[in-house]
């Protein structure tokens, strides 16, 4: 399948936001690309979010998605928000060249996203 590159490790911000780049080596001249973020925990794989975009256009996730992103050539900048400590895990970037044929699919090695819940602020007497 296609080569897909993504960083090995990302640390989410204190606000629960993690960003990483997913880059793929296209064998052909795709006009329609689908990007999916998968979370793998042990032998379970769940879809976090997905977006299809036309080359040269913006990446659009569903309104209720926890993901946003931008695309530039064969590179996709992905942002996942609303993360909590329990969401720490391996996030895999999957890229599919949907149109025109032939169909190509590539799976990244995954980005381990670490999320640390912020410490609650101690009560203050003012």
């Amino acid at each position: 399948a296609m080569h897909v590159a993504q960083p090995a490790v990302v640390l989410a911000s204190s606000r629960g936001i993690a960003s990483f780049v997913c880059e793929y080596a296209s064998p052909g001249k795709a006009t329609e690309v689908r990007v999916t973020v998968l979370r793998q925990a042990d032998s379970q794989v769940t879809e976090v979010c997905a977006a299809t975009y036309m080359m040269g256009n913006e990446l659009t996730f569903l309104d209720d998605s926890i993901c946003t992103g931008t695309s530039s050539g064969n590179q996709v900048n992905l942002t996942i928000q609303g993360l909590r400590a329990m969401d720490t895990g391996l996030y895999i970037c999957k890229v599919e060249l949907m149109y025109p044929p032939p169909y190509y699919l590539g799976i990244g090695n995954g980005t381990q996203i670490y999320v640390i819940d912020p410490e609650p602020c101690p009560d203050s007497d003012f």
Partner: antibody
Framework: EVQLVESGGGLVQPGRSLRLSCTAS????????MNWVRQAPGKGLEWVGQ??????????YYSDSVKGRFTISRDDSKSIVYLQMNSLKTEDTAVYYC??????WGQGTTVTVSS | DIQMTQSPSSLSASVGDRVTITCGAS??????LNWYQQKPGKSPKLLIY???NLADGMPSRFSGSGSGRDYTLTISSLQPEDVATYYC??????????FGGGTKVEIK
């Protein structure tokens, strides 16, 4: 119209060589990873090997059953992919299909290895 | 190498029946799976790509589903022209791009 036409099949003795060709038309050949798939009589499909395209440095991959004996090459200027089969065995007897990506399939060419 | 196990190896159903064929991978393959239809005496044709996407020209009664290691091909209402052998194939790198053993579908 997409077309893949295999040729070069026939009857060959064990230990001998044979070269199959697959001529493509109707699609952008250079964008495609080309595969060979075979089907022994009355059996299922077996992936034989793959040659990728220029962006992937024409990397080749083979199934364990043919590794070291079969070689895939391509000529993008002529839209042809080849399967060079050496040291043929009776178990290589099959219909050989070439595929563009895995989207397009040829009609197949029959290879019979027998003494 | 990842192994692909397809079941059943054959089935017989009536016209209009819902038919389900399963394909299991020995490891997670992330939806990197195609289904093919091979009618008697013909070359195989791509039926479903990427586990869920219907190939051009294929009837909408065919659908694919699944994730992780387990995948399913469904024919919602079997038709006489669906008599064929169906194969799954793993398309995840690295090769080999192994096929399942096939499922022969016949009409009762």
């Amino acid at each position: 119209e997409v077309q893949l036409v295999e040729s070069g099949g026939g009857l060959v003795q064990p230990g001998r060589s044979l070269r199959l060709s697959c001529t493509a038309s109707g699609f952008t050949f250079s964008d495609n990873w080309m595969n060979w798939v075979r089907q022994a009589p009355g059996k299922g499909l077996e992936w034989v090997g793959q040659i990728r395209n220029k962006p992937y440095n024409y990397e080749t991959y083979y199934s364990d059953s043919v590794k070291g004996r079969f070689t895939i090459s391509r000529d993008d200027s002529k839209s042809i992919v080849y399967l060079q089969m050496n040291s043929l065995k009776t178990e290589d007897t099959a219909v050989y299909y070439c595929t563009g990506g895995m989207d397009y399939w040829g009609q197949g060419t029959t290879v019979t290895v027998s003494s | 190498d990842i192994q692909m196990t397809q079941s059943p190896s054959s089935l017989s159903a009536s016209v209009g029946d819902r038919v389900t064929i399963t394909c299991g991978a020995s490891e997670i393959i992330y939806g990197a799976l195609n289904w093919y239809q091979q009618k008697p005496g013909k070359s195989p044709k791509l039926l479903i790509y990427g586990a869920t996407n219907l190939a051009d020209g294929m009837p909408s009664r065919f659908s694919g589903s699944g994730s992780g290691r387990d995948y399913t091909l469904t024919i919602s209402s079997l038709q006489p022209e669906d008599v064929a052998t169906y194969y799954c194939q793993k398309i995840l790198s690295p090769p080999p791009w192994t096929f399942g053993g096939g499922t022969k579908v016949e009409i009762k």
